[in-house]
Amino acid sequence: SERCDDWGLDTMRQIQVFEDEPARIKCPLFEHFLKFNYSTAHSAGLTLIWYWTRQDRDLEEPINFRLPENRISKEKDVLWFRPTLLNDTGNYTCMLRNTTYCSKVAFPLEVVQKDSCFNSPMKLPVHKLYIEYGIQRITCPNVDGYFPSSVKPTITWYMGCYKIQNFNNVIPEGMNLSFLIAFISNNGNYTCVVTYPENGRTFHLTRTLTVKVVGSPKNAVPPVIHSPNDHVVYEKEPGEELLIPCTVYFSFLMDSRNEVWWTIDGKKPDDIPIDVTINESISHSRTEDETRTQILSIKKVTSEDLKRSYVCHARSAKGEVAKAATVKQKVPAPRYTVEGGGGTGGLNDIFEAQKIEWHEGGGHHHHHHHHHH
């Protein structure tokens, strides 16, 4: 057999379909690998051939297109199952060829089972809705091409096990499900079941998606740097460890890249000849607002280091902000020191390790706080 451009197994397209439902699978060659479409290929005399390898088998075999009621058929660059069976799971290959040209790609197809509440191993797409933002809609996905526009299917929407009937803030409107106003309680899995007739038979398409309610752009603000701030002075003796947390709050913004970084004397830490480590942690609120903390650490700080400028920077699609940390070399004899308690929120551990000096409103008195948990 002559050489064939083999694109291998395209695991990026892990196709999952429900058992006992129609499935239309386009040959990925025309979508992702070749510069021309099926019509061009067909008119150039190229033929599209399909075959498959069953699950847990090595043997490639032709697809049986002579099954009763044309259960599996091919139409242009689409492989049709009407409907799927569990044992259709396997790796499918589409090959485009003539006497002088050959190109092929394989992809995995998994036929999955669901229960009556639509629980299954299916990977679910996530649709984000803005909290308290006004009417927003989700649309029953991936149903195009299954039936002609002349066919009017029936669509039923479910949340979990239960049918959604015009109630509260969620209203089914055909292929759309409208959220009059979205709340955190609307988080969850929503399923549309599309039922349509074809050649005297009735088919069902089940599509589940996850709704995640996120922060509204109406409430979005530029990044807010909580730390460093004007109330905290990092006073250290040479040889001690310097730890400065940079804690930044980011409003949720669709497709925004949130960035936090430190500069030391206006340069990136990597460009400074000192031993600096930076550890980052990220947490999210229920509406996907983000808090990023980058802790800058110098194990054994020198008096030179204590003269440097340490600036925390943050950027999102809403803007860029920066805040300098106040770093000082500890004076040998402070006027007095008070041992005391008192909570300072989430950074207690860092503050305790630091024995941070707190500047009381305008006065010159420094207080050591050893925090107890």
Epitope: D115, S116, C117, N119, M159, C161, K163, I164, S185
Partner: antibody, heavy 120, light 107 residues
Framework: QVQLVQSGAEVKKPGSSVKVSCKAS????????ISWVRQAPGQGLEWMGG????????NYAQKFQGRVTITADESTSTAYMELSSLRSEDTAVYYC?????????????WGQGTLVTVSS | EIVMTQSPATLSVSPGERATLSCRAS??????LAWYQQKPGQAPRLLIY???TRATGIPARFSGSGSGTEFTLTISSLQSEDFAVYYC?????????FGQGTKVEIK
């Protein structure tokens, strides 16, 4: 501790309706679903339908469609099951049962049951 | 609708013995099956879901197995409090349906 407390026993005439309540304690309404299951004397269990109280989303067994209405009042954490056009074969203990989540089709907590007797 | 058939209708077992209860579905329900225990005058209690996962607080002597159409509930060593009626429930298809029950009585 999760508790589902149902209303008391009822005696009804054929052709009438009955409305049974199920009050949840322990903040169990939010994010859960409540189903109604009945058990005729000496018989097995029969699922009638259910609701996600937060959404008013319901599902009914075909057998009871049009005759049963399941509702919920979130403010009082109470679910209701109303069965109309009663006949003698509707004599049964009616249970409310909580799903472990809106996506779980099994029942992890049950009410104590309400006996409904249909007799002329 | 899917018909669930339990056997035997009554099972007589001595305390400490093993009890094996069977539940058969009229068509495949995958692993979408639950087991409940009901004592006289009480509401049912969830034992097993997903055919084999024990519910919270259920002793290890209760185990479930099977998939498709054949399922088994095993009580490895019967205690006095285990004498009751046991029901299986399928939730693969609407409507959810229960078996008619197996009564486990003292021999």
């Amino acid at each position: 501790q999760v508790q589902l407390v149902q209303s008391g026993a009822e005696v009804k005439k054929p052709g009438s309706s009955v409305k049974v309540s199920c009050k949840a304690s322990g903040g169990v309404f939010s994010g859960y679903a409540i189903s109604w299951v009945r058990q005729a004397p000496g018989q097995g269990l029969e699922w009638m339908g259910g609701i996600i109280p937060e959404f008013g989303a319901t599902n009914y067994a075909q057998k009871f469609q049009g005759r049963v209405t399941i509702t919920a009042d979130e403010s009082t954490s109470t679910a209701y099951m109303e069965l109309s056009s009663l006949r003698s074969e509707d004599t049964a203990v009616y249970y409310c049962a909580r799903h472990s989540s809106a996506y779980s089709p099994w029942f992890d907590y049950w009410g104590q049951g309400t006996l409904v007797t249909v007799s002329s | 609708e899917i018909v669930m058939t339990q056997s035997p209708a009554t099972l007589s077992v001595s305390p400490g013995e093993r009890a094996t209860l069977s539940c058969r579905a009229s068509q495949s329900v995958s692993s979408n099956l639950a087991w409940y225990q009901q004592k006289p005058g009480q509401a049912p209690r969830l034992l097993i879901y997903g055919a084999s996962t024990r519910a919270t607080g259920i002793p290890a002597r209760f185990s479930g197995s099977g998939s498709g159409t054949e399922f088994t509930l095993t009580i490895s060593s019967l205690q006095s409090e285990d004498f009751a009626v046991y029901y299986c429930q399928q939730y693969n298809n609407w409507p959810w349906t229960f078996g008619q029950g197996t009564k486990v009585e003292i021999k």
